[in-house]
């Protein structure tokens, strides 16, 4: 959960206010109580965004675009809040807001800039292009430009590519990277720097197994405590690699703590779940379940892949059959 | 009974700073704004910008920015405005007065005249 | 900027005489107007503020009106001491204007 807005204090009579997509923010000023009270919001010394004088707010002059989008404290006026209350924020609102106060006995103003930044949660994908495989750290929508970070085995690697398309008002960004043939642990971060929000990716690929047809296998899957905090909502979702895409096998949601099973040979452990621990069991297994299994724990502010490789061979009845 | 008392002249050459004085009596000094109106013929009365004590806040009319600096002392109850790069156009009367949005007393004035 | 715009540079009256001094705004100002009257070789002194609210100690013969964008003035009987520059003034937003002022004759 984040705050409405955070405040960062310049010198003089000027404010940072960082406000996030879509959401509510506040632009502070405050001044030494008095009566006849009038308030101006301007923004760049220029747009009519608020006033209010004799009592009551007079909107008829507003810019067009903060229609229904301010307001003030009114209970709070005379105790000198002239702070301005702001409905959902877009990257068009950034820029320069002065707060004039006139009484009877003061004048101030208060110039307040507002960055607005965007965060949609990324997302780390594991993909199979014809022979190769690919990690993809992606984000929808983020603002400012981020920082995108790749490691290997925690050491950091240079090879970054990032497929960059810029909207209006955010950028989206792929960071591929090919991991064919590596067995090597990897790590993704991206940090947006005005939002001071970091998100990072971690995907690990276990060693093959070689199971025979009929048998059952156990695959774990536990988080890494670096990242992982169970009070915070995440999903943990296991699904199957087959030719090329993946089939959801069940999926696991902190909030509700709801299991949803769509392979019935598939089992989960309640208890090890309530230990943090999503390892799974395929039962009765048949040949078209080699292949590749993920473990994709996510939340906010992390997504934890795990990767099995399983190989299912005849039993010595089935060959004999043949 | 509110009082400003500002020097009656001031005469600085051209490209010379001048700082005014304006010191105030009667009232809590630290509560109200002060305020800096020029008056020439041509021009009339115009307002150059405003200080409140309390906090130091200062607003200025666009058109004296960089010309005029406002601060204010509050241990002595004066304010002071800085004017710099001096020249002709700057000869005026120049009047503290304090308020809030209207200025409820005035200084006498101080004549500034710049010349060589 | 919000200016102010006295039309009439000089009026002349006579004493007794009920005169009107006018000023316009360039947009609505509601009715966040002062007026002040300067005589010869003194420091403006406020008069009237919010368009027609009196300041302390200031004569029932100077009443203030209007709103929005028009304001006047009036002295009721004019007398001699009245002689003087009179300045409209907006405090509705900053930078505050002030009018070009009218100056009164007594004839």
């Known amino acids: 959960i984040f705050p409405l807005a955070f405040f960062i204090y310049v010198p003089m009579n000027e404010q940072i206010v960082i406000g996030r997509l879509d959401e509510d923010i506040i632009l502070p000023s405050s001044f030494e109580r008095g009566s006849e009270v009038v308030i101006h919001w301007k923004y760049q010394d220029s747009y009519k965004v608020h006033s209010y004088y004799k009592g009551s707010d007079h909107l008829e002059s507003q810019d067009p675009r903060y229609a229904n989008r301010t307001s003030l404290f009114y209970n709070e006026i005379q105790n000198g809040n002239a702070s301005l209350f702001f409905r959902r924020v877009s990257l068009l609102d950034e820029g320069i807001y002065t707060c004039y106060v006139g009484t009877a006995i003061q004048v101030i103003t208060n110039k307040v800039v507002l960055k607005v930044g965007v965060f949609l949660t990324p997302v780390m994908k594991y993909e199979k292009r014809n022979t190769n495989s690919f990690l993809i750290c992606s984000v929808l929508s983020v603002y400012p430009r981020p920082i995108i970070t790749w490691k290997m085995d925690n050491t950091p690697i240079s090879e970054n590519n990032m497929e960059e398309t810029g909207s209006l008002d955010s950028f989206s960004i792929n960071s591929p990277l090919n991991i064919t043939g590596s067995n090597s642990s990897y790590e993704c971060t991206i940090e947006n720097s005005l939002l001071k929000q970091t998100w990072t990716g971690r995907w690990t690929m276990k060693d093959g197994l070689h199971k025979m047809q009929s048998e059952h296998v156990s695959l774990s899957c536990q988080p890494v405590n670096d990242y992982f905090s169970p009070n915070q909502d995440f999903k943990v979702t296991w699904s199957r690699m087959k030719s090329g895409t993946f089939s959801v096998l069940a999926y696991y949601l902190s909030s509700s703590q709801n299991t949803i099973i769509n392979e019935s040979r598939f089992s989960w452990n309640k208890e090890l779940i309530n230990q943090s621990d999503f390892s799974m069991n395929l039962m009765d297994l048949n040949l078209s379940d080699s292949g590749e299994y993920l473990c994709n724990i996510s939340s906010d502010e992390y997504t934890l892949l795990t990767i099995h490789t399983v190989h299912v061979e005849p039993s010595q009845e089935t060959a004999s059959h043949n | 009974q509110e009082q400003l008392q500002q020097p009656g002249t001031e005469l600085v050459k051209p490209g010379a700073s001048v700082k005014i004085s304006c010191k105030a009596s009667?009232?809590?000094?630290?509560?109200?704004?002060m305020h800096w109106v020029k008056l020439t013929p041509g021009q009339g009365l115009e307002w150059m910008g405003t200080i409140y004590p309390g906090n130091e806040n200062t607003s200025y009319n666009q058109k004296f920015k960089g010309k005029a600096t406002l601060t204010a002392d509050k241990s002595s109850s004066t304010a002071y405005m800085q004017l710099s790069s001096l020249t002709s156009e700057d000869s005026a009367v120049y009047y503290c007065?304090?308020?809030?949005?209207?200025?409820?007393?005035w200084g006498q004035g101080t004549t500034l005249t710049v010349s060589s | 900027d919000i200016v102010m715009t006295q039309s009439h540079k000089f009026l002349s009256t006579s004493v007794g005489d009920r005169v009107s001094i006018t000023c316009k705004a360039s947009q609505d100002v509601s009715t966040a107007v002062a007026w002040y009257q300067q005589k010869p070789g003194q420091s403006p002194k406020l008069l009237i503020y919010w368009a027609s609210t009196r300041h302390t100690g200031v004569s029932d013969r100077f009443t203030g009106s209007g709103s929005g964008t028009d304001f006047t003035l009036t002295i009721s009987s004019v007398q001699a001491e009245d002689l003087a520059l009179y300045y409209c003034q907006q405090h509705f937003d900053i930078p505050y204007w002030f009018g070009g002022g009218t100056k009164l004759e007594i004839k």
């Open positions: 009667g009232y809590t000094f630290s509560s109200y704004s």
């Open positions: 007065a304090r308020g809030g949005y209207y200025f409820d007393y």
